[in-house]
Structure formats: C-alpha cells, structure tokens
C-alpha cells in the first residue's frame, strides 16, 4: 500500500520559518503534489504550492521556495510575518496524485516537544484520504 510521509521543521535561525518535506512511498508515477496548511486540500485547507513533474512549480505566500528533492519527494520553505505566519501547531498536508494508485494525502505538524532546528524523523503520517 502506498504511503505519504510528512516532516515539519522550524528553522533555528528564524522562528517564523518552517520547512515542510513530503514524500511518496509507492511504485506509481507522481502526476501532481499539492501542499496546503490548516487542513487537507479541499477540506478547509489553504493551498500553498502545487508541483507538477513536467509543468513546473507554483507557490503562494507565505510559501517562499517549493522544490522537488527527488522524483518522489518535495520540500517547501515557508516564511511569514503577522497573519500569514505559520505557528507551532499549524497542520501541513501533502497530497500526492499518482498513477495508478490514485490520490494519497497525509498531514503533519511540528512535534510538540521539538526545539527550533529539530524535527521528528520523516516517518509515514496517517493517511487521511485515498481517492
């Protein structure tokens, strides 16, 4: 069964800066990745970035830099201030559309006890939805 993992890290140098890393553990080819915050995409969450392996990357503030790390994992740096700034308990979700598995989404947030600059290892997060 395919799995999606999500890792959230707060940068030690800038407390309003977060790095989200997501990956897809499956054999299919990824056709689209959507990153959102505040909940799953299409379920109250706000889209931060969309990554298509052939069409490129689109992102919206407070996303600063979205990129493909490998052909099955992505990272997103968020930088914010004021209302657009993420906070420690913000939930981030990654949705991977793949063929032939379909869509798989998982969410994660900053581990409650983590110090700035630290994070939990990238373990698979609970699968919220498989379309």
């Amino acid at each position: 069964t395919p799995e999606v993992w999500v890792q959230v890290r707060m940068e030690a140098t800038e407390l309003s800066s977060f790095t989200i890393r997501c990956g897809f553990l499956g054999s299919g080819s990824i056709s689209l990745v959507t990153v959102s915050w505040g909940g799953p995409n299409g379920a109250g969450g706000t889209t931060l970035a969309v990554l298509h392996p052939e069409r490129g990357i689109r992102q919206w503030a407070p996303a600063r830099q979205a990129r493909w790390e490998t052909q099955s994992s992505i990272s997103l740096i968020l930088e914010g201030s004021g209302a657009s700034s993420p906070c420690a308990n913000t939930t981030f979700c990654c949705k991977f559309a793949s063929f032939p598995e379909g869509s798989w989404e998982a969410c994660g947030s900053l581990p409650p006890s983590s110090d700035p600059g630290l994070s939990a290892p990238p373990t698979p997060a609970p699968i919220l939805r498989a379309d």
Epitope: R55, G56, W60, R67, W68, E69
Partner: antibody
Amino acid sequence: QVQLQQPGAELVKPGTSVKLSCKASGYNFTSYWINWVKLRPGQGLEWIGDIYPGNYSPNYNEKFLNKATLTTDTASSTAYMQLNNLASEDSAVYYCASGYFDYWGQGTTLIVSA
Amino acid sequence: DIVMTQSPSSLSVSAGEEVIMSCKSSQSLLNSGTQKNYLAWYQQKPGQPPKLLIYGTSTRESGVPDRFTGSGSGTDFTLTINNVQAEDLAIYYCQNDHSYPYTFGGGTKLEIK
C-alpha cells in the same frame, strides 16, 4: 466542459480604473489557480500574475505590481483583475487562464480612450 | 526575469513542408529534482486565445497531432511541425514554465503560402 467566460470588450477613459471578470464553470473553482495574461499586438504575451482561490496572496509580475490587483469570489466562481490609473498602453486583450494555462478565456479587449 | 527569445519572428512555408522554430532562454529551464526542462509551447490562431500544445519541452497536450514535436534542453529549445497544414496558420509562443514571472517569447508567426 471547462469554460472561462470573459466580457468581450470594455471602453474606459484614461486615468480611471476597470475591473475585468473571469467566470469559471465546468470544474471545481477552488482546485485550480487563475492566471492573467496581457496581449498587445506585435508585443506578444505577458504574464501579469496568478491567484489561488481561497489564498489571499496573489503572485504578480513586478512590472504589473502597481497596475493590477487580483481577487477571487469563490461563491460565484469568478476571478477579477482590477487595473488602475489606466493609460493608452493598457489597451490590450486580457486573458484569464486556469491552472498550468490549460484552459483560456476568450479574452476581454480593453480600450483606453478619451 | 528569464528572457525568452524566439526566432525567426515569421516564416512562410507551403503545405506539406517541415517547419522548425527556435526558442532560447536566458537561464536554464532544467529542474534538478525531476530532470525535466520546464518549457511550454502555445499556438494562437487569429481571433482565438492561445492553446497549449506542448509542455515539459516534449510532451504533447491531449489532442495535439503528432506532427508537432518539441525538443531541447537547458536554454535551447525547438518546435518542429512536420507536414504543415493550412490550419497551422498561427503565432507560436514558447514559455518559461520554470519560475516566476512566467515569461513568454515574442512569438513566431507561421504563414502558409
């Protein structure tokens, strides 16, 4: 099928503002972002910016930062672009296009003339 | 900003011939993570909005005839139209799909003799 409906033409006076609309149908409006593109004869296409419905932080081409304001109304599945302080060089065809420019509206011809 | 330069600005060919048009970018359009070049081609026929033809340098959009072929990498790209038809009369634009702002080339106008 996916459709992006735009008014055919707008005639406005120099120094005024105009709000162009782009009504989407045939898909979930909040699933794709809307791009705005300017076309002037002989000058090619220029990307103005994009906006994701529900995200209130549009991206702008710096060239249009003080000219265009992008908004959306999810209730009516409509995207808007307001152009201010209009001048003759703003006369052009303005297109909206969804997502990765997969679908385009027919364009609104904006004529700025006294 | 990435500057996209197309050549020639116009060309005229007879039906059945092959057409090759060039697009050069001022910076590489290669994405290191996917090893894909993020370049798209559009066709704009008179009185119509642009239509996506090719993305990712060489992937044809659904419904686009295989007479249209995209190639290239890095900063140099090419659109080839084999067996040109009368309905191919249009302006062809290349576009940087790599990074904001998503700049277009100046276009190549294809006329049919």
